[in-house]
Interface confidence: low
């Protein structure tokens, strides 16, 4: 398994992981105590036939070409958690590991 | 976690799992001994904001709206394997569990 890494200067048009810093303060999400911002990353780009396909299923659906199938799209294929300190709905302070907050790899599925 | 199930008569345009039978014989994949066909299913449809989003990350990227982020897309969020009997590259008959061959649930990521 591998995925491409790009930045805003890349000429790559295929499915790629791009850097993105999420700033909770800028969103007005004041219930998040820490971190105030973190590197989330995101996936963007074209999914050429068989390029970075995660599953054999993706290839089979492309072959069968059913009505309405849009072809594979560029989406996270590996994600990781971050630890966060936040207020829950009862105004209690919670420290916890929030899953799937960071994109580590992008692929076509 | 839940996902919508549709069929070809559905009026749903949002992200949904549709039935699809993959026929290996029709593809000319004669190295597959069994099954000759199986129910693979596939995902198709629009991803409304926060509808069926698998990860909080998806929502955050939508908020941050970076250049080139296309919004979430409808993709398998739960898959299961099937057992297959097939010839490998050395013409040996292999019986094995092939992962991620059946879409059990679709979501937006």
């Amino acid at each position: 398994d591998f995925g491409l890494d790009c930045d805003e200067h890349s000429t790559e048009s295929r499915c790629c992981r791009y850097p993105l810093t999420v700033d909770f303060e800028a969103f007005g999400w004041d219930w998040i105590i820490a971190p105030k911002r973190y590197k989330a990353n995101y996936c963007s780009g074209e999914c050429e036939f068989v390029f970075l396909q995660k599953y054999p299923h993706t290839h089979l659906v492309h072959q069968a070409n059913p009505r309405g199938s849009a072809g594979p799209c560029c989406t996270p294929t590996k994600m990781s958690p971050i630890n966060m300190l936040y207020f829950n709905g009862k105004e209690q302070i919670i420290y916890g590991k929030i899953p799937a907050m960071v994109v580590d790899r992008c692929g076509c599925s | 976690d839940f996902g919508l199930d549709c069929d070809e008569h559905s009026t749903e345009s949002r992200c949904c799992r549709y039935p699809l039978t993959v026929d290996f014989e029709a593809f000319g994949w004669d190295w597959i001994i069994a099954p000759k066909r199986y129910k693979a299913n596939y995902c198709s449809g629009e991803c409304e904001f926060v509808f069926l989003q698998k990860y909080p990350h998806t929502h955050l990227v939508h908020q941050a709206n970076p250049r080139g982020s296309a919004g979430p897309c409808c993709t398998p969020t739960k898959m299961s394997p099937i057992n297959m009997l097939y010839f490998n590259g050395k013409e040996q008959i292999i019986y094995g569990k092939i992962p991620a061959m059946v879409v059990d649930r679709c979501g937006c990521s």
């Epitope: - | 839940f2 919508l4 199930d5 549709c6 008569h9 559905s10 009026t11 749903e12 345009s13 949904c16 629009e46 991803c47 409304e48 904001f49 926060v50 509808f51 919004g71």
Partner: antibody, heavy 124, light 107 residues
């Protein structure tokens, strides 16, 4: 409260085009499908198509497909329906309606809010 | 396309009466049927969805029933404000199709 306010009445000549607007307020415009329905004078209701403002994907009734275009402007929370090559039998009141989704099954929705309607008269 | 046949096309009734309007689909629509009320010069108003569920704010004198291809709207005790035209709509398949309407008039 949730409201759909449509543009005013129009008089058009045969062969011309008309563009009707539907301004939404009181809810998140991008999260709901907008449908268009028309009603000729003294006649029943006819579904024309829908559009999803989040990404502009539309679905048209085959009967109008060659002549209709539905668009949205998310910056102003406005949906538009343009009908081209107008004929006298296109004289009708055109309504926009919001699709409200209430369940987990594919067709679990109904029209919960309607615009007030826009009369389009096609006459030479 | 699915055809929706509504009957009767017009109906005369008195205040206090119980009336029933029917809608027949050309194929099974899986209870994906809505009912609307429309008054002259006004937009339609949703009354019932999913064949028998009442839209919030609609009085309980309106009720819907049916399954498969046959559906009914019942108004239990007519009031002056109920005299209007009623339409059914199937949302099981595109294109969505309406019944031709039932005009409910005061006798």
């Amino acid at each position: 409260q949730v409201q759909l306010v449509q543009s005013g009445a129009e008089v058009k000549k045969p062969g011309a085009s008309v563009k009707v607007s539907c301004k939404a307020s009181g809810y998140s415009f991008t999260g709901y499908f907008m449908h268009w329905v028309r009603q000729a004078p003294g006649q029943g209701l006819e579904w024309m198509g829908n559009i999803y403002p989040y990404n502009g994907v539309s679905n048209y009734n085959q009967r109008f497909k060659a002549r209709v275009t539905m668009t949205t402007d998310t910056s102003t929370s406005t949906a538009y329906m343009e009908l081209r090559s107008l004929r006298s039998d296109d004289t009708a009141v055109y309504y926009c309606a919001r699709r409200y989704y209430y369940g987990t099954k594919p067709a679990d929705w109904y029209f919960d809010v309607w615009g007030q309607g826009t009369l389009v008269t096609v006459s030479s | 396309d699915i055809q929706m046949t509504q009957s009767p096309s017009s109906l005369s009734a008195s205040v206090g009466d119980r009336v029933t309007i029917t809608c027949k689909a050309s194929q099974d629509i899986n209870s994906y049927l809505s009912w609307f009320q429309q008054k002259p010069g006004k937009a339609p108003k949703s009354l019932i969805y999913r064949a028998n569920r009442l839209v919030d704010g609609v009085p309980s004198k309106f009720s819907g029933s049916g399954s498969g291809t046959d559906y009914t709207l019942t108004i239990s005790s007519l009031q002056p404000e109920d005299f209007a035209t009623y339409y059914c709509l199937q949302s099981d398949e595109f294109p969505l199709t309406f019944g031709q309407g039932t005009k409910l008039e005061i006798k």
